[in-house]
Interface confidence: medium
Amino acid sequence: HNTTVFQGVAGQSLQVSCPYDSMKHWGRRKAWCRQLGEKGPCQRVVSTHNLWLLSFLRRWNGSTAITDDTLGGTLTITLRNLQPHDAGLYQCQSLHGSEADTLRKVLVEVLADPLDHRDAGDLWFPGESESFEDAHVEHSISRSLLEGEIPFPPTS
């Protein structure tokens, strides 16, 4: 799976979309999880309604919401009041019993609020590498992470 980058501004909302084949994933619940380290597990943040037919209903866990358009084949995650600590690697998943298939790998970048004059030193996002000129743009605030780019911040 390629990684798609979604950028959001601190304090604002960020909407992440994960398209999928609606016929292939018929009847499957979906989830949004956060990758813990490059090879670590993906920790569940929020999942769609327990009743698959009610997947369109928005479910919240803290400041993160999930809703599934099962007909159109689009899982949408909303991160409200984006904070620096929200930056990192996530996955959209299709659930099957105790197993999960990755629909999309997502890198969330948190940008400093241009109207906020406080020190932005605690905001992390990967530096723009020379390989981004061919990146696929999902919408104005997302792009695909190309091979060779590091999705995790360097550990000190």
């Epitope: 084949d21 609606s22 016929m23 292939k24 009847g27 007909l71 099957h96």
Partner: antibody, heavy 117, light 107 residues
Framework: EVQLVESGGGLVQPGRSLKLSCAAS????????MAWVRQAPKKGLEWVAT????????YYRDSVKGRFTISRDNAKSTLYLQMDSLRSEDTATYYC??????????WGQGASVTVSS | DIQMTQTPSSMPASLGERVTISCRAS??????LNWYQQKPDGTIKPLIY???NLQSGVPSRFSGSGSGTDYSLTISSLEPEDFAMYYC?????????FGGGTKLEIK
Amino acid sequence: EVQLVESGGGLVQPGRSLKLSCAASGFTFSDSAMAWVRQAPKKGLEWVATIIYDTSSTYYRDSVKGRFTISRDNAKSTLYLQMDSLRSEDTATYYCALFGVDVMDAWGQGASVTVSS
Amino acid sequence: DIQMTQTPSSMPASLGERVTISCRASQGISNYLNWYQQKPDGTIKPLIYYTSNLQSGVPSRFSGSGSGTDYSLTISSLEPEDFAMYYCQQYDSSPWTFGGGTKLEIK
């Protein structure tokens, strides 16, 4: 118990039309995805079409696209396959199937369609 | 379209024997593979879904495994009612496609 009963099969000339029906019972039809799968004589199975909710969410194999229409009547718990401009290669037993999570959970007994002049 | 190749096309076997039917996809299908049984009277029923999950009501002598492009169905000890046609089916991408079938015959 889930039951799927196909009807409407028969002998038809090339270029003509035929409509298959599949009466469903034993489950909530309106909440279910349904499919048609066919099997030519002495051949393997071939997926034909799937309907998820209604006619806005239908899928077809390329060879029947534009000629076949899958539809449903939730009030009657019935699935349909309208087959137009029939060809000899459409000769097959047509099975109606209930599409569950990942797998076609239940199948009908099949309706035989022969396209010949 | 993804081509599904089943081997063997026919298999003579004895009661109590362990048999394995193979299915190869023309490209990786990420475990999106099902197995179906078709009896001589035309009755079709699902056995295994998503590579290795036993369909409700199916005896535990049936099992499935595989990954990538190569998958298999194993019957640990053949019973009289197991002599039938077996089909694999991928649903990784549309159109869904089936293997050509394996006829399990009494030796």
